[in-house]
Interface confidence: medium
């Protein structure tokens, strides 16, 4: 499996030139792409991540409250080569 | 249609300054990276400087670091470029560039800046 | 010198087939970033060709294909025409330069 790759402040995603792709490690079956966003009194901070994953494909929509910070994650997982953009 | 018109070129003495503005219609500014590649009299392109689409993540080629200043106004859909302490050497056709899917998919038609004394 | 190498020049007959190399180096189509192809007609600005080494924008006709393979890319044109004629130059992301890099381009020559 091939899938995109990258790490960047979620504000603005990743740079449309900046994209990689990735070969995936054996037995890994999904594409990934994760924003995380946690919220401090100081603001929020984000970020963007895509590359190789685990588990099954699909969306997955998470809100924590890690005692006062408050944690955003936007999971989402596919099967085909390249299918994370 | 997307279209990208640029503008400010023109001549100017070493060690001077020039504003390029680059009119973005067609798209939703806001949400596009843009960039700026030049082109020297008969040579290849160069990529000078890019920015987000929110302007908080800027980049610069080394060549023109220090000198040159990108930044955008989404509320006038406009990109521009700062050129400051100018050199005969960044004499080029200056176009502002669309980053779509991966890559520059829209070029303006480029405006001339010739440093000469 | 471009960080991205290319020949300076090719030529075909119409019909032909061309291919145009685009090597690089680890810091950029061998880090895995993907590679990009603009076209540039005489005196006009360039236009997006190929794009994520191999993907051809809507209204790109299929005779233009790309690949990567390692640290080189290249970019094949089969059926030449006249109208191909103009400068191809190829690009990618690079990690030392923190910026994407375009290769010196190739002046394609339709001949006869």
């Known amino acids: 499996l091939e899938c995109y790759s990258c790490v960047q402040k979620a504000d603005d995603g990743c740079s449309p030139n900046k994209m990689k792709t990735v070969k995936c490690a054996p037995g890994v079956d999904v594409c990934t792409e994760a924003v995380g966003a946690v919220e401090t009194i100081h603001g929020q901070f984000s970020l963007a991540v895509r590359g190789c994953g685990s588990g099954l494909p699909g969306k997955n929509d998470r809100g924590l409250d890690l005692h006062g910070l408050l944690a955003f994650i936007q999971l989402q997982q596919c099967a085909q080569d390249r299918c994370n953009a | 249609e997307v279209q990208l018109l640029e503008s400010g070129g023109g001549l100017v003495q070493p060690g001077g300054s020039l504003r390029l503005s680059c009119a973005a219609s067609?798209?939703?500014?806001?949400?596009?990276?843009m960039s700026w590649v030049r082109q020297a009299p008969g040579k290849g392109l160069e990529w000078v400087s890019y920015?987000?689409?929110?302007?908080?993540?800027?980049y610069y080629a080394d060549s023109v670091k220090g000198r040159f200043t990108i930044s955008r106004d989404n509320s006038k859909n406009t990109l521009y470029l700062q050129m400051n302490s100018l050199r005969a050497e960044d004499t080029a056709v200056y176009y502002c560039?669309?980053?779509?899917?991966?890559?520059?998919?829209?070029w303006g038609q480029g405006t001339l800046v010739t440093v000469t004394s | 010198q471009s960080v991205l190498t290319q020949p300076p020049s090719a030529s075909g007959t119409p019909g032909q087939r061309v291919t145009i190399s685009c090597t690089g180096s680890?810091?950029?189509?061998?880090?895995?970033?993907?590679v990009h192809w603009y076209q540039q007609l005489p005196g006009t600005a360039p236009k997006l060709l190929i794009y994520d080494n191999n993907k051809r924008p809507s209204g790109v006709p299929d005779r233009f294909s790309g690949s990567k393979s390692g640290t080189s890319a290249s970019l094949a044109i089969s059926g030449l025409r006249s109208e191909d004629e103009a400068d191809y130059y190829c690009a990618a992301w690079d990690d030392r330069l923190n910026g994407p890099v375009f290769g010196g381009g190739t002046k394609l020559t339709v001949l006869g």
């Open positions: 560039a669309r980053e779509g899917l991966w890559a520059f998919d829209y």
């Open positions: 067609g798209f939703t500014f806001s949400n596009a990276w």
């Open positions: 680890s810091s950029n189509i061998g880090a895995g970033y993907v």
């Open positions: 920015i987000s689409s929110s302007g908080s993540t800027i």
